[in-house]
Amino acid sequence: SSPTSSASSFSSSAPFLASAVSAQPPLPDQCPALCECSEAARTVKCVNRNLTEVPTDLPAYVRNLFLTGNQLAVLPAGAFARRPPLAELAALNLSGSRLDEVRAGAFEHLPSLRQLDLSHNPLADLSPFAFSGSNASVSAPSPLVELILNHIVPPEDERQNRSFEGMVVAALLAGRALQGLRRLELASNHFLYLPRDVLAQLPSLRHLDLSNNSLVSLTYVSFRNLTHLESLHLEDNALKVLHNGTLAELQGLPHIRVFLDNNPWVCDCHMADMVTWLKETEVVQGKDRLTCAYPEKMRNRVLLELNSADLDCDPILPPSLQTS
């Protein structure tokens, strides 16, 4: 059947009323107010409706739920817990809904949830147990295989007095619940570093997107255990050079494709190993587009066209010869 709007008609100030009305037991094929439903497509869309909370009367058949462009602010524990449970819900998109807090157990009682998109929400407070649901050292495995967390960094003045990277990683690692995660997108989050333990504990990853962050170095990051990794997006970061250990780990991954465009590569003597590697490796996509940013004399030179004579470091003068 074609998508049907709810019979009720609300103005943009109606979310409170909608939630009050929905306290009654839901009808079998009921569609929440301000939403569009298609039972044939098993899809519910409550998009750009300024909802302040998750509708309570979601139909049990829902497999794909879009709650984008709303004003949810807080996702409490059991935000999607229903009786009977939403046993079919597989894909949940909450992007751009002004969420600033996701509490422990927010996604509990969703046994089929495979895809979750929280992108474009200023998550100042992401509970370590948002995805694991409990504070046990080893939680029940989450069914999530795809977690999209692009641009969830809050404005600087809204951040807690703790590392944003640390907060996100704590949620990813809690209870080892995300061992089955295959796709993780963390683009556009101003990450300065990647905590060294995060990748080792996500062994099933196939796709990792860290593009458009502020990563300066991968020296302490290990990719060795990510034997299933197919794509690694590192475009638009602040990478200066990749060192031998990283090159060897990437080269050894059986399925990998690496994306390195638009990083400020420093073409001095420390770049020699990476240039040698680039000339022979087939794992870097679009490697002919990689160019130097520094030093000034090397700007815009193509990395693949450099030779060892081009890659020098200014000698370090002894203190007695240095000028102030």
Partner: antibody, heavy 122, light 111 residues
Framework: EVQLVESGGGLVQPGGSLRLSCAAS????????MSWVRQAPGKGLEWVGF??????????ENSASVKGRFTISRDNSKSTLYLQMNSLRAEDTAVYYC?????????????WGQGTLVTVSS | DIVLTQSPLSLPVTPGEPASISCRAS??????????LQWYLQKPGQSPQLLIY???NVESGVPDRFSGSGSGTDFTLKISRVEAEDIGVYFC?????????FGGGTKVEIK
């Protein structure tokens, strides 16, 4: 399930041309390097060449024995790989296999087609 | 081009017994810590199937009686207990450098 199905083989005279096709399914075709490998009757395997993926501009590499005569191409809209063979010689007689490279192409081919026989004879 | 030399050319085997095939490269096939050397089995009338990649990684779905070892220029494929279905021609292949090259093959047959 990954599948590769070759076609286009047959009997051709020396100096003639032939185009082999390989229809691919079960994977994202544009992500992968694709190759041709041949095997003369009763002989070993010989790498003919490969074509790179979208990320690396679909550029090609060929073995010296076929350079200038054979061209590898792909139609990504049809998920099909081609081998255009010109100026064929008797020594090009072989079963031609289409194969997919692993995601990291340094690890070579993980899936092969069933092969198509090309016979060059007058 | 890198030349791969396999030995023996022919290997008669007894089911249940172990078997071993050697592959020697004319130069190192190692690149940044990984040896890019594969082993394939071509059963009679079939196309080649991948057994081992990167010298020692067993391809998914391949029985664990197959193992690969070696680095640099010297490599070995071992079958811990040969089964009747293992007969065919075994090829090593290097993908360290273009052109990729294959060994001449080792024919494994039941005694």
């Amino acid at each position: 399930e990954v599948q590769l199905v070759e076609s286009g083989g047959g009997l051709v005279q020396p100096g003639g041309s032939l185009r082999l096709s390989c229809a691919a399914s079960g994977f994202t075709f544009t992500d992968y390097y694709m190759s041709w490998v041949r095997q003369a009757p009763g002989k070993g395997l010989e790498w003919v060449g490969f074509i790179r993926n979208k990320g690396n501009g679909y550029t090609t590499e060929n073995s010296a024995s076929v350079k200038g005569r054979f061209t590898i191409s792909r139609d990504n809209s049809k998920s099909t790989l081609y081998l255009q063979m010109n100026s064929l010689r008797a020594e090009d007689t072989a079963v031609y296999y289409c194969a997919r490279y692993r995601g990291n192409p340094h690890y070579a081919m993980d899936y092969w087609g069933q092969g198509t026989l090309v016979t060059v004879s007058s | 081009d890198i030349v791969l030399t396999q030995s023996p050319l022919s290997l008669p085997v007894t089911p249940g017994e172990p078997a071993s095939i050697s592959c020697r490269a004319s130069e190192s096939v190692e690149f940044y810590g990984t040896s890019f050397l594969q082993w394939y089995l071509q059963k009679p009338g079939q196309s080649p199937q991948l057994l081992i990649y990167g010298a020692s990684n067993v391809e998914s779905g391949v029985p664990d009686r197959f193992s690969g070892s070696g680095s640099g220029t010297d490599f070995t494929l071992k079958i811990s207990r040969v089964e009747a279905e293992d007969i065919g021609v075994y090829f090593c292949q290097q993908s360290r450098k273009v052109p990729s090259t294959f060994g001449g093959g080792t024919k494994v047959e039941i005694k």
